[in-house]
Amino acid sequence: MGCDRNCGLIAGAVIGAVLAVFGGILMPVGDMLIEKTIKREVVLEEGTTAFKNWVKTGTTVYRQFWIFDVQNPDDVAKNSSKIKVKQRGPYTYRVRYLAKENITQDPEDHTVSFVQPNGAIFEPSLSVGTEDDNFTVLNLAVAAAPHIYQNSFVQVVLNSLIKKSKSSMFQTRSLKELLWGYKDPFLSLVPYPISTTVGVFYPYNDTVDGVYKVFNGKDNISKVAIIESYKGKRNLSYWPSYCDMINGTDAASFPPFVEKSRTLRFFSSDICRSIYAVFGSEIDLKGIPVYRFVLPANAFASPLQNPDNHCFCTEKVISNNCTSYGVLDIGKCKEGKPVYISLPHFLHASPDVSEPIEGLHPNEDEHRTYLDVEPITGFTLQFAKRLQVNILVKPARKIEALKNLKRPYIVPILWLNETGTIGDEKAEMFKTQVTGKIKLLGMVEMALLGIGVVMFVAFMISYCACKSKNGK
């Protein structure tokens, strides 16, 4: 009888020990299985979870626009006063709803190439007005022409055309015209076959971004989605030195197993450069734990503050010998037009940039860019890309519309907020397929280990107690 009890207790302890060992073994084995599954599923090839979502994003992406309506156009043109602006918006468009096209796998170098078609659909229900709402904004052609043609002879010619077309420093345009293009009356007078359509995003609809060639991750998962080349080149030809490199992914996803210490590098064709994001905080997105990576102020700093940025300063006059910060001259990428990119309301920009503009209210929460990345898969499940489009306008002695200006202005035209968040259905699916399974496996591991240890300890204590009792 005593033997039976002892044997039972030892058997219980052994079972507990086996369960604990099995739970312990399951930890690295389970992690290995998860890793193997993740590595298989994030590869960009037909049949994987990643590929399906990569071809056509399952996230609804909106681009909201706020237009800077100029309140004192005549005063600025006549007296070179501060420009008073009032933002109007949001005007919302649905974007990135089109699937990638011309998808071609290259098994030789483990890459996949594609183009991303552009399209925008106005969403009246998410907007404060219609596409026909009018705004007073800088005259894009009048501001750009003397910048492109800096020679005084041509400026006299341009002045004749500007006067003839009754154009001035500012103009009134509808949202649709401003964003997507309008026939400019001044450019229409140029007696050569030039493009006379002007718009901040012209041309956009029915155009494509790319060709992109990205690593599919088949041979090396740590390279998945990283851009190998853009438009057939590994460099942009816009910037000197390393600033010209195409680094990282397109920000839609990153190689899996993202650590907080990692700097996420990505290329954005909108700003004609590669940039980076650093870990900000851990957040819960619809029950999915994600890492929020933010664009640091350092990325927009002057070379004085961040020497790495020296090659993004390509012009010495407007940048006050590279001491100004928070604006990026992307003219080289925009056919020589004086386009400057910044954060909305000149967030993180030097005071000299925003000084000539009244009515700006930079706000970190509203105006910063962030990416919410699920760390195991590297998928960006939520993002907010915020940027502002500005045009440089300078005094031009030979152009009457600009001759009264006493200083250059970097004039804000609009700012945009492009956002995407994983849908509820997709989030549930993601939880079930990825985080749910990992949680479940973790729970099983912990349960086996816990139950095993408890069983082993309990049965061993009982056995010892029993033995000492019998001994007495």
């Epitope: 800096q150 020679n151 005084s152 002879f153 041509v154 006299v156 010619v157 002045n159 004749s160 055309l161 006067k163 003839k164 007078l189 140029v190 007696p191 050569y192």
Partner: antibody, heavy 117, light 107 residues
């Protein structure tokens, strides 16, 4: 086809006047503006005057300022160079030429102006 | 006014030769330089604008280079019809100014 035809040249006494015409076809002078360029016998080219597009400003070489006047009649698509107080050094072949960005892509055949007593 | 100094003022060459004519501006004119060819008794003909841009219909043996103050017209292989006088011109500032010309003669 773009064509420029000058006329009005001839022999004139020092201190005299002459009006040169430049009839354009194949384009509108209003959109381009017109220049006059001259070439003294055996010498190089010298820019003389310019009328900017759409009846814009007029510009002259220092050597002719105050004596020569450039004008255009858009209805006739013709440019003119009114030359007063002519001097011996104004003797040259006068060309009218079309330009927009400052280089001359079309030239007339030229008309000879001789200033001599 | 911007002075344009051409050199040489004349040169002798044979058919098939490579010929180079230079032009120097008295101040920076960026790439706003044109080149013309003129034959006796005829109006000048545009060869090159914006320092390097070959005008339509001009044979590809003609090429232009340079930026700022120093410019060059090159004829890669001289043809019989190329014997003429060549002028550079700046189209950066009014008054527009020409070089004094380079006469290319048969050796």
């Amino acid at each position: 086809e773009v064509q420029l035809v000058e006329s009005g040249g001839g022999l004139v006494q020092p201190g005299g006047s002459l009006r040169l015409s430049c009839a354009a076809s194949g384009f509108t002078i209003d959109a381009f503006g017109i220049h006059w360029v001259r070439q003294a016998p055996g010498k190089g080219l010298e820019w003389v005057a310019w009328i900017a597009p759409y009846g814009g400003e007029t510009y002259y070489a220092d050597s002719v300022k105050g004596r020569f006047t450039i004008s255009a009649d858009t209805s006739k698509n013709t440019a003119y160079l009114q030359m007063n107080s002519l001097r011996a050094e104004d003797t040259a072949v006068y060309y009218c030429a079309r330009s927009f960005f400052g280089y001359f892509d079309y030239w007339g055949q030229g008309t000879l102006v001789t200033v001599s007593s | 006014d911007i002075q344009m100094t051409q050199s040489p003022s004349s040169l002798s060459a044979s058919v098939g030769d490579r010929v180079t004519i230079t032009c120097r501006a008295s101040q920076d004119v960026s790439n706003w330089v044109a080149w013309y060819q003129q034959k006796p008794g005829k109006a000048p003909k545009l060869l090159i604008s914006y320092a390097t841009s070959l005008y339509s219909g001009v044979p590809s043996r003609f090429s232009g280079s340079g930026s700022g103050t120093d410019f060059t017209l090159t004829i890669s292989s001289l043809q019989p019809e190329d014997f003429a006088t060549y002028y550079c011109q700046q189209h950066s500032n009014a008054p527009l100014t020409f070089g004094q010309g380079t006469k290319v003669e048969i050796k």
